[in-house]
Interface confidence: low
């Protein structure tokens, strides 16, 4: 048994007579043999769930669900209630109605076995019938909505009449009907004004019925019509078995360069026309099991269940359904030497499905794990300016396909063949498994005998110690020019183009800082700033070279405070700035301020 609504509404007035009928509550059957029996909760409750008083005023007919006043609500009774609701002049109180023999504790009132009946209390007597508007004669203030379970026996779920109006205003005639399309499963009995279902409903065919209730009021010569929405929602049960969309039960996958833990290797989709179990219960009740194969496969892969609600068309209307994505995921990083082919099977079980048929599917994943070989090109040729500053990035080395790698840990090393010419260093970028070449020793750059540098690049896979090698030939170009006096260590300090381009700074490949002119569009990623190289700084990412020294690119790497209009970077630096941004790395501060368009001559004069 279940209630067709979770809440009912009616009005209560002072001194309404004992015996006044108030409203009907309705229960629908889950099985044909069920007989509803209603009981009231012991207490009246206030708007904030405050327990106001024992219910001494309202009774229920256990078999019919009719609520009525068994004694008049006089002023003293009203005070008894209002005083506990801290004297609000208009009080809404509610009662809990239970379906026997549902043994719910009074403290809990949840659909389907309990409904709340709300009474709007008016500290006046019932108004004169002639003063009631048609809307008040026809429908409660709060519009009802109904919930009916699919596949259940048909039954009565609503009674249109406002019982106190009918009881106290017998001379006013009120008639009701339902506006509905052809073949809809509802009827309104003209005599009793009860609304019932004609047959069991199927949610997978239609989930919502937006009906319209029409009320016609006859009072003397006047006739008025009132219309209100009458929505019915069909509640789901697990009556559909899971299926494969387009019959696809097998997915094939190749694991090669992406070998990192948590990588999604392949996905298979399962469709279920139901939307139960509800999301909170779904993963517990809709199970997926990777069937035992070899131990290696069990340790290496796991299956993740990702359910999502979707909507499908049925009989011209949309109904909700569920798609379940089952992802085969790497449980650990795979070594580059791993080389296997296997078939994995996953058992999916919709454990709530009662049939007919089975709620079980078998998913197949064909997986090939390929080994990865490390290859470097035979030779790299690069040039570097003699004026380059320490930490200047001059190029990259990268094993074949390194941009595509994940979960493969390659370390790069440089072995210098020239004596005392260890000018360059290399660091491995975590992002793309490449090695970034940078200037490590500027003194060596200036030595005449270091005009041509020869290195061996060695790439080593940390897990297997497999290696690849390549020659690196670096030509040192240009002549050295000493730094201007008074230049800061960091390009980022400079606030104006002129002073920026006069100086070099840590990380500068040319020995000169570069000015990046912003777009001037408010707080923007393209703010004006002074950088060692606009190729790498700022780019919204503090790279592995820039992390070596905060003076290289504080715009990307600063963890300190940023003053002025900006959007902070994640997890550090300036993501977007207003106007020009300059930084003082030693003080761990950056400033973003409007563009300064003063004439440089004025600057000199002002000094």
């Amino acid at each position: 048994l279940y209630f067709s609504r979770d809440a009912y509404w009616e009005k209560l007035y002072v001194d309404q007579a004992a015996g006044t009928p108030l409203l009907y509550v309705h229960a629908l059957r889950d099985a044909p043999e069920e007989v509803p029996s209603f009981r009231l909760g012991q207490h009246l409750y206030g708007t904030y769930r405050t327990r106001l008083h024992e219910n001494n005023w309202i009774c229920i007919q256990e078999d019919t669900g009719l609520l009525y006043l068994n004694r008049s609500l006089d002023h003293s009774s009203w005070e008894k209630l209002s005083v506990r609701n801290r004297g609000f002049p208009l009080l809404t109180v509610y009662l809990k109605v239970f379906l026997s023999p549902t043994s719910l504790r009074e403290g809990e009132c949840q659909w389907p076995g309990c409904a709340r009946v709300y009474f709007s209390f008016f500290n006046t007597s019932f108004p004169a019938c002639s003063s009631l508007k048609p809307r008040e004669l026809c429908f409660p203030e709060t519009r009802p909505s109904f919930r009916i379970r699919e596949n259940r026996p048909p039954g009565t779920f609503h009674q249109f009449r406002l019982l106190p109006v009918q009881f106290l205003c017998p001379n006013i005639s009120v008639a009701y009907r339902l506006l509905e399309g052809e073949g809809l499963p509802f009827r309104c009995a003209p005599d009793s004004l009860e609304v019932s279902t004609r047959w069991a409903l199927d949610r997978e065919q239609r989930e919502k019925y937006e009906l319209v209730a029409v009320c016609t009021v006859h009072a003397g010569a006047r006739e008025e019509v009132v219309m209100v929405p009458f929505p019915v929602t069909v509640y789901d049960e697990d009556d559909s078995a899971p299926t494969f969309p387009a019959g696809v039960d097998t997915a094939s996958a190749v694991v090669e360069f992406k070998r990192k833990e948590d990588t999604v290797v392949a996905t298979l989709r399962v469709f279920d026309a139901d939307v139960v179990p509800a999301s909170g219960e779904l993963v517990r009740r809709y199970t997926s099991t990777l069937l035992p194969g070899d131990t290696w496969a069990q340790q290496t892969f796991r299956v993740e269940h990702w359910p999502n609600e979707t909507s499908v068309q049925a009989n011209g209307s949309f109904v909700r359904a569920t798609v379940h994505d089952y992802r085969l995921v790497l449980n650990r990083n795979l070594s580059i030497s791993e080389n296997r082919t296997m078939q994995l099977a996953v058992l999916v079980n919709d454990s709530d499905f009662q049939g007919p048929g089975a709620g079980v599917l078998l998913l197949h994943f064909n997986v090939s794990v390929l080994p990865v070989s490390l290859h470097l090109p035979s030779t790299y040729s690069l040039s570097v300016s003699r004026r380059a500053r320490r930490f200047a990035q001059i190029g990259k080395v990268c094993v074949e396909n390194c941009q595509a790698f994940s979960g493969i840990n390659v370390q790069y090393k440089l072995h210098s063949s020239g004596a005392n010419c260890s000018t360059l260093g290399v660091v491995t970028s975590a992002e793309d498994t490449s090695g970034i070449l940078f200037v490590n020793d500027t003194k060596a750059l200036r030595r005449p005998k270091c005009a041509e540098l020869h290195y061996m690049v060695v790439a080593t896979d940390q897990q297997t110690s497999r290696q690849a090698q390549a020659q690196l030939l670096v030509t040192v170009e240009g002549s050295y020019v000493a730094e201007e006096a008074g230049c800061p260590l960091s390009c980022a300090v400079s606030k104006r183009r002129l002073e920026c381009e006069e100086c070099g700074g840590l990380g500068s490949p040319t020995g000169r800082c570069e000015w990046r002119q912003g777009d001037g569009k408010g707080i923007t990623r393209n703010f004006s700033t002074c950088s060692p190289s606009t190729k790498t700084c700022p780019d919204g990412h503090c790279d592995v070279v820039e992390t070596q020294d905060i003076n290289i690119c504080p715009q990307d790497c600063l963890r300190g405070s940023i003053v002025g209009g900006h959007e902070p970077g994640e997890p550090r630096g300036i993501k977007a700035g207003y106007g020009t941004c300059n930084c003082f790395p030693e003080e761990e501060k950056c400033f973003c301020e409007p563009e300064d368009i003063q004439d440089p001559l004025c600057d000199e004069l002002c000094r």
Partner: antibody, heavy 118, light 107 residues
Amino acid sequence: EVQLVESGGGLVQPGGSLRLSCAASGFTFTTYFMSWVRQAPGKGLEWVSGISGSGTSTFYVDSMKGRFTISRDNSKNTLYLQMNSLRVEDTAVYFCAKENTYGHFDFWGQGTLVTVSS
Amino acid sequence: DIQLTQSPSFLSASVGDRVTITCWASQDISSHLAWYQQKPGKAPKVLIYDASTLQSGVPSRISGSGSGTEFTLTISSLQPEDFAAYYCQQLDGYPYTFGQGTKLEIK
């Protein structure tokens, strides 16, 4: 002008009784809930008891139920707190407070000191 | 019974400072909370009720916010007369309960 004046406090031995009174003026006494709130020396506020405007409904903090009785005489605009079986821990300043319709205490008396000591 | 927990218990501040006192309820009390100020030897005085409504006659530098289980009292710019004890009180149901209090003293 709303005025609440408490009286009846004093020194009493453990196990003894006291009756506190609160004379109210400046508002329609029968319309409002009234409460007693106490404050032990150097401690915080503790709500003790409340009563509805007509006097038909009374409320107590659990630890005082059965020992304390709140009442009111609407013809005299007076609130009472009868305290029996007093304990040392009942030593406090007892305030009478008018409850606003919303529920908060918008007017308070000056308080009366109750000392329970042997 | 509904328990109220105030934080901090003691607060040192200077004239002109902005201070915030927090009150947590052991269960949802909607907006049914009041704040009181009490000076030594005096009766409490209501400042805020319904969590955020200023009692008439209370200066606008005092404000309240919150609902459910977390509430705050804020004094935007402390004045010499604001140094006192502050209490929150739930008005959701009997027995009414108070927080343990926050003593605001001059730094």
